[in-house]
Interface confidence: low
């Protein structure tokens, strides 16, 4: 359990940099995370909206706080989900 947990952690932390990448090859991963963010009402992997770097400006409603009952914060003038997605992803992987 702890070993697999460590591998998942490392993989997610490693993949955080893909969110701020601008190449075509990273787009699929970015789009998967966008869908996950909307489903689980979270933002980014480790550092929240900052994980997206300049891509935050290219996706007009990235992390948009639709359900304001959930914790939200202001980032670059937009209301975004405060919670990062890493714990949700780990839970999701553990259950599936």
């Amino acid at each position: 359990k702890s070993k697999s947990d460590r591998i998942v952690n490392e993989t997610l932390y490693e993949n955080t940099k893909l969110l701020s990448a601008t190449g075509e090859s990273e787009k699929q991963f970015q789009e998967a995370i966008i869908v996950f963010q909307e489903e689980f009402k979270c933002c980014g992997l480790v550092n929240g909206a900052a994980d997206w770097g300049n891509n935050f400006q290219h996706y007009p409603e990235l992390c948009a706080c639709l359900d304001k009952q959930r914790p939200c914060q202001s980032y670059n003038g937009k209301q975004v989900y405060k919670e990062t997605c890493i714990s949700f992803i780990k839970d999701f992987l553990a259950k599936n």
């Epitope: 909307e38 007009p60 639709l66």
Partner: antibody, heavy 121, light 106 residues
Framework: QVQLVESGGGVVQPGRSLRLSCAAS????????MHWVRQAPGKGLEWVAV????????YYADSVKGRFTISRDNSKNTLYLQMNSLRAEDTAVYYC??????????????WGQGTLVTVSS | EIAMTQSPATLSVSPGERATLSCRAS??????LAWYQQKPGQAPRLLIY???TRATGLPARFSGSGSGTEFTLTISSLQSEDFAVYYC????????FGQGTKVEIK
């Protein structure tokens, strides 16, 4: 200036279908979330559905879930509401409205004049 | 679903007088509340958003206040064009409207 013009309303029998359209102009349609809001004769306002700027996310009121479908064509600056399995209680003026944001997660800032849908046998 | 309750259902006021309309949410909606005005045969029009911010071009006689669950729309000196139905709407968790307050001439 922002203009929202609804069409497609009319009289329809219970159980039948109808599709409403909303032609938008005076703003960058593809940047805004859009809602449908309805008002039964002599009654208050009821939120029906919302669609994000890019059509990716859609949300519905429980009263219409599974029967109504909201969609948009950004190339035509048009919003749609496909209404199936219509019931008498769906009789209302249907307003096409614009959200202040792209995600359709904020307040409604512009309204069309509405189109009347009457469900009656 | 967050329920919005407006009171009174009807408010009878003389022109020039002050009108105070109330709106209560079943749970906190922070400041995510808007007010709309609707005249007979017309579409609603945005008056206030963020509980207290006036929409562009709205006269200063209209003001909104409150946060959490209790909100107020005040019209300081009613003009003939202000007699209408007023709705509050929360956008904190999806969207729900109050049932409306009709402001009529006394």
């Amino acid at each position: 200036q922002v203009q929202l013009v609804e069409s497609g309303g009319g009289v329809v029998q219970p159980g039948r279908s109808l599709r409403l359209s909303c032609a938008a102009s005076g703003f960058t349609f593809s940047s805004y979330g859009m809602h449908w809001v309805r008002q039964a004769p002599g009654k208050g306002l009821e939120w029906v559905a919302v669609i994000w700027y890019d059509g990716r996310n859609k949300y519905y009121a429980d009263s219409v879930k599974g029967r109504f479908t909201i969609s948009r064509d950004n190339s035509k600056n048009t919003l749609y509401l496909q209404m199936n399995s219509l019931r008498a209680e769906d009789t209302a003026v249907y307003y096409c409205t614009r959200d202040h944001s792209g995600s359709g997660s904020y307040y409604i800032d512009y309204w069309g004049q509405g189109t009347l849908v009457t469900v009656s046998s | 679903e967050i329920a919005m309750t407006q009171s009174p259902a009807t408010l009878s006021v003389s022109p020039g007088e002050r009108a105070t309309l109330s709106c209560r949410a079943s749970q906190s909606v922070s400041s995510n509340l808007a007010w709309y005005q609707q005249k007979p045969g017309q579409a609603p029009r945005l008056l206030i958003y963020g509980a207290s911010t006036r929409a562009t071009g709205l006269p200063a006689r209209f003001s909104g206040s409150g946060s959490g669950t209790e909100f107020t729309l005040t019209i300081s000196s009613l003009q003939s064009e202000d007699f209408a139905v007023y709705y509050c709407q929360q956008y904190n968790n999806f969207w729900t409207f109050g049932q409306g307050t009709k402001v009529e001439i006394k």
